[in-house]
C-alpha cells in the first residue's frame, strides 16, 4: 500500500481524507492509529462512533477528530493545533471485530512557520475558519507494501 505524505504547519490544523469502497466497508467502524516504528503495532488514536449509523458524528480524542461519511466512503481525520510531536506514520483503518484493514498509510510531516508571527500569506489559515488541507503540498511515495488484514490485539 502506498504511503501518502501530508505536510501541515505547526499550530494549524491538518485534515486527512481517506476514501474507501462504501459497499465493501458497509457496517464497519473506522479508526486512526499511529504506527510505532516501521514494523511495529499501530496504536489507536481515535475511532468513529460505536454505532455505525452515527459514524457521521465527530469523535474526538485530544486534538484529533474523526468523522465518517459512510455513504460517500470518506473518513476524515482532523489533527488540530499541529505540533512537532504529531509527525509520524499513521493509518486509516476499517474495523471488523478484532480485525483492522489498512485503508491508507499517511506520513504526517510538521513544518515550522518560517515567518514566525509574521503574515504567512496564502499558506496561513486560521484554525477557526478552515483546515489546512495538506493536499496543497501532498505527494505520494510508492512503498509497495501489501494491504494486510491482521488482528488488532
Amino acid at each position: 500500500l502506498n504511503t501518502t505524505v501530508l505536510q501541515g504547519m505547526a499550530g494549524q490544523s491538518l485534515r486527512v481524507s481517506c476514501t474507501y469502497d462504501a459497499l465493501k466497508h458497509w457496517g464497519r467502524r473506522k479508526a486512526w492509529c499511529r504506527q510505532l516504528g516501521e514494523e511495529g503495532p499501530c496504536q489507536r488514536v481515535v475511532s468513529t462512533h460505536g454505532v455505525w449509523l452515527l459514524a457521521f458524528l465527530k469523535k474526538r480524542n485530544g486534538s484529533t477528530v474523526i468523522a465518517d461519511d459512510t455513504l460517500a466512503g470518506t473518513v476524515t481525520i482532523t489533527l488540530k493545533n499541529l505540533q512537532a510531536g504529531d509527525a509520524g506514520l499513521y493509518q486509516c483503518q476499517s474495523l471488523r471485530g478484532r480485525e483492522a484493514e489498512v485503508l491508507q498509510k499517511v506520513l504526517v510531516e510538521v513544518l515550522e512557520d518560517p515567518l514566525d508571527d509574521q503574515d504567512a500569506g496564502d499558506l496561513w489559515v486560521p484554525e477557526e475558519s478552515s483546515s489546512f488541507e495538506g493536499a496543497q503540498v501532498e505527494h505520494s511515495t510508492s512503498r509497495n507494501q501489501e494491504t494486510s488484514f491482521p488482528p488488532t490485539s
Epitope: 469502497d21 459497499l23 465493501k24 457496517g27 464497519r28 455505525w52 471488523r96 471485530g97 478484532r98 488482528p151
Partner: antibody, heavy 123, light 107 residues
Framework: EVQLVQSGAEVKKPGESLKISCKGS????????IGWVRQMPGKGLEWMGI????????RYSPSFQGQVTISADKSISTAYLQWSSLKASDTAMYYC????????????????WGQGTMVTVSS | EIVLTQSPATLSLSPGERATLSCRAS??????LAWYQQKPGQAPRLLIY???KRATGIPARFSGSGSGTDFTLTISSLEPEDFAVYYC?????????FGGGTKVEIK
C-alpha cells in the same frame, strides 16, 4: 433467485493445472465477499480463503497460501479457484459460498453456497 | 490460528429428543460464530450466525447461544431431517476456521 453455480467435476493428473469457477446470480456480485471451502473425502470443512469481487481483495488461510490462487472477474460475476500444479492430496470437494453477513457488528455468515466441484487428482 | 473443538464427535438420539452440541474456541471469538448443517451429498447450510441469530428460513427449533469461547447449538426437538453433521465456524480472526463437526445420528 440468489445462487452460486460452480463448474463441473474435474479429473486430473498430478502436476496438471486447473481453474474451477463459481458464478453468482440474482444479487450484486461485487458487493459481497466470496469464500472458498475444501472438504476432503469423508472429512470436515476447511477454510481456504475469501475474496471481495469488487476490487479482488483476497485473503488466504496460511494452510493454502501459495498452494492455490483465488481470483474474480466481476464483469461476468465469477470467482475462481486455481492450481498451477495439482497433487493427489488436492482431491476433494470444493465449495464457494457468499458471505451474507460480514461487518463490524456481525460475524461471517456463509448464507448462499454453490453445489460444489469435485476435483479428483490421480495418476 | 483459532482452533474450534466440537463435542461430542457423534450424538446418537431419537426423533423428538433434544440435541445439545458444543463448540469451544481456543481463544475468544466474541460472538463471531456461525453454525452450519450438512447432509450427505449436499452443500452446507447456514443455520445460525452471530452465535444466536437464526438465518433466513431456519426453523425455531434451532437455537444458538454463548459468547467468548463457549458456544452451544440446541435443537429443541429433533425432526427426521435434522440428522446430519453440524459445523461451527469462527470469523473473529482470519483464517475463519471450522470446527471438526458433530454428527447427529439416529439412535
Amino acid at each position: 433467485e440468489v445462487q452460486l453455480v460452480q463448474s463441473g467435476a474435474e479429473v486430473k493428473k498430478p502436476g496438471e493445472s486447473l481453474k474451477i469457477s463459481c458464478k453468482g446470480s440474482g444479487y450484486s456480485f461485487t458487493s459481497y465477499w466470496i469464500g472458498w471451502v475444501r472438504q476432503m473425502p469423508g472429512k470436515g470443512l476447511e477454510w481456504m480463503g475469501i475474496i471481495y469481487p469488487g476490487d479482488s481483495d483476497t485473503r488466504y488461510s496460511p494452510s493454502f497460501q501459495g498452494q492455490v490462487t483465488i481470483s474474480a472477474d466481476k464483469s461476468i460475476s465469477t470467482a475462481y479457484l486455481q492450481w498451477s500444479s495439482l497433487k493427489a492430496s488436492d482431491t476433494a470437494m470444493y465449495y464457494c459460498a457468499r458471505a451474507g453477513h460480514y461487518d463490524d457488528w456481525s460475524g461471517l455468515g456463509l448464507d448462499v453456497w454453490g453445489q460444489g466441484t469435485m476435483v479428483t487428482v490421480s495418476s | 490460528e483459532i482452533v474450534l473443538t466440537q463435542s461430542p464427535a457423534t450424538l446418537s438420539l431419537s426423533p423428538g429428543e433434544r440435541a445439545t452440541l458444543s463448540c469451544r474456541a481456543s481463544q475468544s471469538v466474541s460472538s463471531y460464530l456461525a453454525w452450519y448443517q450438512q447432509k450427505p451429498g449436499q452443500a452446507p447450510r447456514l443455520l445460525i450466525y452471530d452465535a444466536s441469530k437464526r438465518a433466513t428460513g431456519i426453523p425455531a427449533r434451532f437455537s444458538g447461544s454463548g459468547s467468548g469461547t463457549d458456544f452451544t447449538l440446541t435443537i429443541s426437538s429433533l425432526e427426521p431431517e435434522d440428522f446430519a453433521v453440524y459445523y461451527c465456524q469462527q470469523s473473529s480472526v482470519h483464517p475463519y476456521t471450522f470446527g471438526g463437526g458433530t454428527k447427529v445420528e439416529i439412535k
